[in-house]
């Protein structure tokens, strides 16, 4: 059994690792943005024993925009992305609250950004494929860039290509 | 066809740093997100870190303080800088191409380079 993706938060991204039951996962707020006092950030992947569906557990993570940020300028494009490490202290404790907010995501306010792909209009940089990959760790620490850029990557081939050594998860999307 | 391709590999001491690369190409290419793993032979690939679009990151717990992950997006690059290196980091290390399932959902595709050695010895 496995879970589905995890919902999207806003202003928020997570890298799933394994959709299996029990797998716990973080959200990262983005840059600029930092955790609010109280939320937590942790999902895990859970079964409902009446109906049998493995689902992820709602986070009550809300990434704010930083104040201390406010008023600083974007940084530059096409400049290196330098991620400091900053720790943030996380439980799955019964009150799914974490004991204090993150410091901030970064330095830069920028949270969003578009990719302009050949043949295309400009898309967000988040779009839904397929395939899945089951690793091993689930222990996270969360790291702060110091800076970001105005541009981003987006996977958009369709082809799907496995080599050795590759071990896939059993979970499918559904789109 | 999405290539990635990883190097800056070696041999290094118990305490020394490496920096690698993983360059990214293709049709019309680009990422929302990038992961590094690694494996060792006889194991699941381990998760190391990850780099999204808006710059934030994240790393395993057994790394944390010691790998920084970063990108520089005109050249389609993504490094993990590796210091006080430990012989249990002696891995094969991929970089992953992610995928997104949902709005800030991502995970690893089933676009892998053909990994770079990683060996710490004395």
């Known amino acids: 059994i496995t879970c589905p993706p995890p919902m999207s938060v806003e202003h928020a991204d997570i890298w799933v690792k394994s959709y299996s039951l029990y797998s716990r996962e973080r959200y990262i707020c983005n840059s600029g943005f930092k955790r609010k006092a109280g939320t937590s950030s942790l999902t895990e992947c859970v079964l409902n024993k009446a109906t049998n569906v493995a689902h992820w557990t709602t986070p009550s993570l809300k990434c704010i925009r930083d104040p201390a940020l406010v008023h600083q300028r974007p940084a530059p494009p096409s400049t290196v992305t330098t991620a400091g490490v900053t720790p943030q202290p996380e439980s799955l404790s019964p009150s799914g609250k974490e004991p204090a907010a993150s410091s901030p995501s970064s330095n830069n306010t920028a949270a969003t950004t578009a990719a302009i792909v050949p043949g295309s209009q400009l898309m967000p940089s988040k779009s839904p494929s397929t395939g899945t990959t089951e690793i091993s760790s689930h222990e996270s620490s969360h790291g702060t860039p110091s800076q970001t850029t105005a541009k981003n990557w987006e996977l958009t081939a369709s082809a799907s290509h496995q080599p050795p050594g590759v071990y896939p998860q059993g979970h499918s999307d559904t789109t | 066809e999405v290539q990635l391709v990883e190097s800056g590999g070696g041999l290094v001491q118990p305490g020394g740093s490496l920096r690698l690369s993983c360059v990214g190409s293709?049709?019309?290419?680009?990422?929302?997100?990038v992961g590094w793993y690694r494996q060792t032979p006889g194991k699941q690939r381990e998760w190391v870190a990850v780099i999204f679009a808006s710059g934030s990151t994240d790393y395993a717990g057994s790394v944390k303080g010691r790998f920084t992950i970063s990108r520089d997006n005109a050249k389609n690059t993504v490094y993990l800088q590796m210091n006080s290196l430990k012989p249990e980091d002696t891995a094969v290390y991929y970089c992953n191409a992610g995928v997104t399932t949902n709005p800030g959902v991502h995970r690893a595709s089933s676009y892998w380079g053909q990994g770079t050695q990683v060996t710490v010895s004395s």
């Open positions: 293709g049709d019309g290419f680009s990422i929302s997100a």
